[in-house]
């Protein structure tokens, strides 16, 4: 199983601060529910990096749901969560900055951003709110951050994990920072199954950040994320690599699932996302 | 100065095809997208689509999808906006609208064409 | 498709009194994608709000915006004679752009 053969490196904690999540759900999406009570509630936007409100139904839903703006912080944030270094070294645009606008295979039409390489600067696009390209934004500052050059021609990087909107998904961005950062797994490991909007039952598979593995689901055959995958070892090659577990003394380590005997204590209340 | 100038009023009947124009000028026609937004007498605003003229890129009201056809001249800077297979609730006073690439502040409009349509 | 309605249909106000318009959508908008339109009769809308609260080139102070989620309001603290007119909210956050019926302010 190519599950067992894959490790992580050892990172440790003297490294630039990377986007902390105290816990994996507070990477999920604002989920109100099918119920149609209009409770204000609060959860964490990882695009904004803050505790925001929003409308919850009243049930069902999801754990990124919060009855006060203060439990939500508690939860979710921590004091350097926000730092964002950037640099003045000239960089390359990441590659998918030159993708077409992509709108899709659904029809959940959104308003998104995009870098228009033609007219070299970011522009709004309709999505149809599933797939398509990483070219994608759901903030036009997040589309200039990474895609636009900065004053005088530089690229502005961001050393912090950039946020891209992608279905509600933590997205490093490929910059040529020393490979000691790089996180190698795309930024919809960290996002929740999504059945989708459709009635099929498909079987597919998707990576479960919290426990470390590809674990089958039910696909409904549109709609949906990206963290959804036709076989397990596409799911693992995808996923496995990136993902970095915090153990609870300190350090950050992936377990060797081959030796079966051999147990290490997760601390999973802290998940690092490293920037690539 | 901006300015965006549309073609008179029509009187069609109904499943007849319109076809309206919006001269644009003082601006770069081509750095904006153009709506086509029509009113209802004593209605609200509908929206029926938007196109970009340096690279035709169109998003149509599903609504008006089938019976909508924007275009552009980019020689002319003129948009274009096509409504077939008229009906009497088609009635209504039609604008051109123009709004940056990065959303849809609708910050200048032409002066409406009023499109009459019975039979 | 997002639909926005707009309450009351008719304000009948005195100048100088406060009004408070009302917007409601039928699903959640990011206070990013919601502006407000101004129409007098005859003429074409002018944009008055964007983004909520930022107030469109030369509108006087005395209009506000705020909300979030599925309710917005466009308040005037106290009328002036040129205040009367049909204003519309208009949201842009989903596909297609859709805008709510207006409010016609009108004088007692």
């Known amino acids: 199983d190519s599950e067992e053969d894959e490790e992580h490196t050892i990172i440790t904690d003297t490294e630039l601060p990377p986007l902390k999540l105290m816990h994996s759900f507070c990477a999920f999406k604002a989920d109100d529910g099918p119920c149609k009570a209009i409770m204000k509630r609060f959860f964490f936007n990882i695009f904004t990096r803050q505790c925001e409100e929003f409308i919850y139904g009243g049930c069902e839903g999801n754990q990124n749901r919060f009855e006060s703006l203060e439990e939500c912080k508690k939860m979710c944030t921590r004091d350097n969560a926000n730092r964002i270094i950037k640099t003045t070294l000239q960089q390359e645009k990441p590659d998918f900055c030159f993708l077409e606008e992509d709108p899709g295979i659904c029809r959940g039409y959104i308003t998104r951003y995009f870098y228009n390489n033609q007219t070299k600067q970011c522009e709004r696009f309709k999505y149809g709110g599933c797939l398509g390209n990483m070219n994608n934004f759901e903030t036009l500052e997040e589309c200039k951050n990474i895609c636009e050059d900065g004053p005088n021609g530089f690229q502005v990087d961001n050393y912090g994990t950039q946020l891209n909107a992608v279905n509600n998904s933590l997205t490093p961005q490929s910059t040529k920072v020393p490979s000691l950062f790089e996180f190698h797994g795309p930024s919809w490991c960290l996002t929740p199954a999504d059945r989708g909007l459709c009635r099929a039952n498909e079987n597919r598979f998707y990576y479960n950040s919290v426990i470390g593995k590809c674990r089958p689901f039910k696909y409904s055959g549109c709609g949906g994320n990206e963290n959804n995958f036709t076989s397990k070892q596409e799911c693992l090659r995808a996923c496995k690599k990136g993902f970095i577990q915090r153990i609870s003394k300190g350090g950050l380590i992936k377990t060797k699932r081959k030796r079966k005997k051999q147990r290490v204590k997760i601390a999973y209340e802290e998940i690092f996302v490293k920037n690539m | 100065e901006v300015q965006l100038v549309q073609s008179g009023a029509e009187l069609k009947k109904p499943g007849a095809s319109v076809k309206l124009s919006c001269k644009a000028s003082?601006?770069?026609?081509?750095?904006?997208?153009m709506h086509w937004v029509r009113q209802a007498p004593g209605q609200g605003l509908e929206w029926i689509g938007e196109i970009k003229p340096d690279q035709g890129r169109i998003n149509y009201n599903e609504k008006f999808k089938t019976r909508a056809t924007l275009t552009a001249d980019k020689s002319t800077s003129t948009a274009y906006m096509e409504l077939s297979s008229l009906r009497s609730e088609d009635t209504a006073v039609y604008y051109c609208?123009?709004?940056?690439?990065?959303?849809?502040?609708?910050?200048?409009w032409g002066q409406g064409t009023t499109v009459t349509v019975s039979s | 498709e997002i639909v926005l309605t707009q309450s009351p249909a008719t304000l009948s106000l005195s100048p100088g009194e406060r009004a408070t318009l009302s917007c409601s959508a039928s699903s959640s908008v990011s206070s990013s994608y919601l502006y407000w339109y101004q129409q007098k009769p005859g003429q074409a809308p002018r944009l008055w709000i964007s983004?909520?609260?930022i107030l469109a080139s030369g509108v006087p102070a005395r209009f506000s915006g705020s909300g979030s989620g599925t309710k917005y309001t466009l308040t005037i603290s106290s009328l002036e004679p040129e205040d009367f007119a049909v204003y519309f909210c208009?949201?842009?956050?989903?596909?297609?752009?859709?805008f709510g019926q207006g409010t016609k302010l009108e004088i007692k």
């Open positions: 983004g909520t609260s």
């Open positions: 609208a123009r709004s940056s690439v990065v959303d849809t502040a609708m910050d200048y």
């Open positions: 003082g601006y770069t026609f081509t750095s904006y997208w």
């Open positions: 208009h949201q842009w956050s989903h596909y297609p752009f859709t």
